[in-house]
Interface confidence: low
Amino acid sequence: LMGGQDKPFLSARPSTVVPRGGHVALQCHYRRGFNNFMLYKEDRSHVPIFHGRIFQESFIMGPVTPAHAGTYRCRGSRPHSLTGWSAPSNPLVIMVTGNHRKPSLLAHPGPLLKSGETVILQCWSDVAFEHFFLHREGISEDPSRLVGQAHDGVSKANFSIGPLMPVLAGTYRCYGSVPHSPYQLSAPSDPLDIVITGLYEKPSLSAQPGPTVQAGENVTLSCSSWSSYDIYHLSREGEAHERRLRAVPKVNRTFQADFPLGPATHGGTYRCFGSFRALPCVWSNSSDPLLVSVTGNPSSSWPSPTEPSSKSGICRHLH
């Protein structure tokens, strides 16, 4: 992580993207350690901020305001040099969020993708954003930035992500910024979970009492595998939401989850996927599709005995 020969390396934890009112730790890494350092902002690289205060190891900045947004550098302590300080570090951009209304984030063709595919994440807003930023949760690097297209009516930007591999799966948010204040970002979009499938062997999906049932009869779908999946995800064709349950080890050494669907009203095509706790956004191949048919008089769409999980939250652990 070292900079050039006499350049420290400035980094931000947990991220360079900081919510208004939040805190960020700035660390200046110099000569194989965190020494005393001074901070500089924007192009005023000769004038240290915070009244020339010297920091040790890290400086926790906050609660941040829009005025904290901008480019920072540090100089590490170098007692035997003429100035006593190193050359300036790499520039580090701190972006402060929550300054405009949130944009919307969509995935094309959808948030559930096969390994190796490419997804377009489209960030759009009816606010006249000049730039859009895309950020993946848990990543400390700068977010990707694109110039917004179109005019004031609807601004949008298309971020191409791929070819998809496990490291790119996760929770994404996008932000917008208006002209003249490029590092003062909007509130974050609602989170969007990008899930990669096809990485592990497919589970099997079965229905109890069977795939063809009478209207009103209780149906349970069982997803199982010899693989030690932690979580199973059940999706129904045409529905945006998936349900998920913890896998339970069975005496026959399989790992299984039983999804109670309640009294049958409408049929549908179901698939299930397995995933591991360590990589909640990386799923197995899909099970073979299971068509559940209902005989008799269907009345309304299938009730949900448990709330289906929301559009996001897939990439969070099941506690």
Partner: antibody
């Protein structure tokens, strides 16, 4: 559910001022811009502009710059359209509609300008 | 400004008939197009957004298609309650612009 409720019909003389309200409910008011649309008798729909409900910044179509003003009372989740120095050609039904693709509409407010 | 040309301006159709209304933009508007239904004395009703996405609660006999400059609204099997005036709207660029409208009446 999402609703936009507009104020009642107005009968005005030329030169007067009218202020129409549009009260929103069922969603977070500041999450969607509010559009205003005009429909003159026997004519089609015409987009007048929109107001950013988060910042309060209005944007007007060219034909509606000058005498027309959009405003907000965010605490009451209400948007307003004010027309100053009314002319006969302002006789129309005015609609508020929220979101970038005008997803939900108010019931419309008929403004009649007549001597 | 982007000009939206809607056709036909009026039409008669029979119940159960398949009806298509078209809208042409003077320049590429991607898929940023909505369709609305207007009935006398009622609020306009949004049917379709993003060219082909059906608004919740709108009957599935309505569908939208197209991208770029050419768009259409189709009613697969006309019902009595479908009579009214239909408008398209581009929201790709300011100012937003509506088509001239299509009056749909039952034969």
């Amino acid at each position: 559910q999402i609703q936009l409720v507009q104020s009642g019909p107005e009968l005005k003389n030329p030169g007067e001022t009218v202020k129409i309200s549009c009260k929103a409910s069922g969603y977070i008011f500041t999450n969607y811009g509010m559009n205003w649309v005009k429909q003159a008798p026997g004519k089609g729909l015409k987009w007048m502009g929109w107001i950013n409900t988060y910042t309060g910044e209005p944007t007007y179509a060219d034909d509606f710059k000058g005498r027309f003003a959009f405003s907000l009372e965010t605490s009451a989740s209400t948007a307003y359209l004010q027309i100053n120095n009314l002319k006969n050609e302002d006789t129309a039904t005015y609609f508020c509609a929220h979101g970038p693709w005008l997803a939900y509409w108010g019931q419309g407010t008929l403004v009649t300008v007549s001597t | 400004d982007i000009k939206m040309t809607q056709s036909p301006s009026s039409m008669y159709a029979s119940l159960g008939e398949r009806v298509t209304i078209t809208c042409k933009a003077s320049q590429d508007i991607n898929s940023y197009l909505s369709w609305f239904q207007l009935k006398p004395g009622k609020s306009p009703k949004t049917l379709i957004y993003r060219a082909n996405r059906l608004v919740d609660g709108v009957p599935s006999r309505f569908s939208g298609s197209g991208s770029g400059q050419d768009f259409s609204l189709t009613i697969s099997s006309l019902e009595c309650e479908d009579m009214g005036i239909y408008y398209c709207l581009q929201y790709d660029e300011l100012p937003y612009t509506f088509g001239g409208g299509t009056t749909l009446e039952i034969k």
